[in-house]
Interface confidence: low
């Protein structure tokens, strides 16, 4: 678990994109809108983050939909399919 | 697998240059985002400079405009031009791949910088 910090001044990140590869898993975690990240999901796999970053996504992710993903996002997961446990699947709604 | 060996480095006075390689064995080299680490004597290992698959590039705040991260994937060889270097360059350089697809735990022997003032 990401231990939750303020974001620094100037880091918060506007879009999803490759600068992200090189924040800090805080950095992620304080400066990345979970809601931001879920409409942008598309933009996930096409960027070299590492496993420890991804799992710092899908926490984020996981606070957004506490009772799972909506298919918006399921449809978008990529890499961050890797990340996700029996009870994490068990909770879509999938049609 | 893609097995990487890092080259290049040297000792160099403060405001010189260096030019490291890393030469890597896959045949899907190219597909793959690289890029290149440094871990200094006591300090955790940081990515100083990616580049995709397509050739974006993405650079650490401490090396913008010092640092140029390039690969020729015909030689399936990823390049980092060290320009105007400081003293907290020194560090060991290693390269290596920035996807999920690949495990992102086996590391080469890195390649020594050494920065005097």
């Known amino acids: 678990e990401v231990e939750k910090t303020a974001c620094p001044s100037g880091k918060k990140a506007p879009e999803i994109d490759e600068s992200l590869i090189f924040y800090k898993k805080w950095e992620l975690e304080a400066c990345v809108d979970a809601a931001l990240l879920a409409t942008q999901m598309d933009r996930v796999n096409a960027i070299p983050f590492t496993y420890e970053q991804l799992d710092v996504l899908k926490h984020k992710l996981d606070e957004l939909y506490p009772q799972g993903y909506p298919e918006s996002v399921i449809q978008h997961l990529g890499y961050l399919f890797l990340k996700m446990s029996p009870e994490d699947i068990r909770k879509w709604n999938v049609t | 697998e893609v097995q990487l060996v890092e080259s290049g480095g040297g000792l160099v006075q403060a405001g010189g240059s260096l030019r490291l390689s890393c030469a890597a064995s896959g045949s899907t080299f190219s597909s793959y985002p690289m890029g290149w680490y440094r871990q200094a004597p006591g300090k955790q290992r940081e990515l100083v400079a990616a580049?995709?698959?397509?050739?974006?590039?993405n650079y650490a705040d401490s090396v913008k405009g010092r640092f140029t991260i390039s690969r020729d994937n015909a030689k399936n060889t990823v390049y980092l031009q060290m320009n105007s270097l400081k003293p907290e360059d020194t560090a060991v350089y290693y390269c290596?791949?920035?996807?999920?697809?690949?495990?992102?735990?086996?590391w080469g022997q890195g390649t020594q910088v050494t920065v005097s003032s």
């Open positions: 290596n791949t920035r996807s999920p697809r690949v495990p992102n735990d086996s």
């Open positions: 580049i995709s698959s397509g050739g974006s590039t």
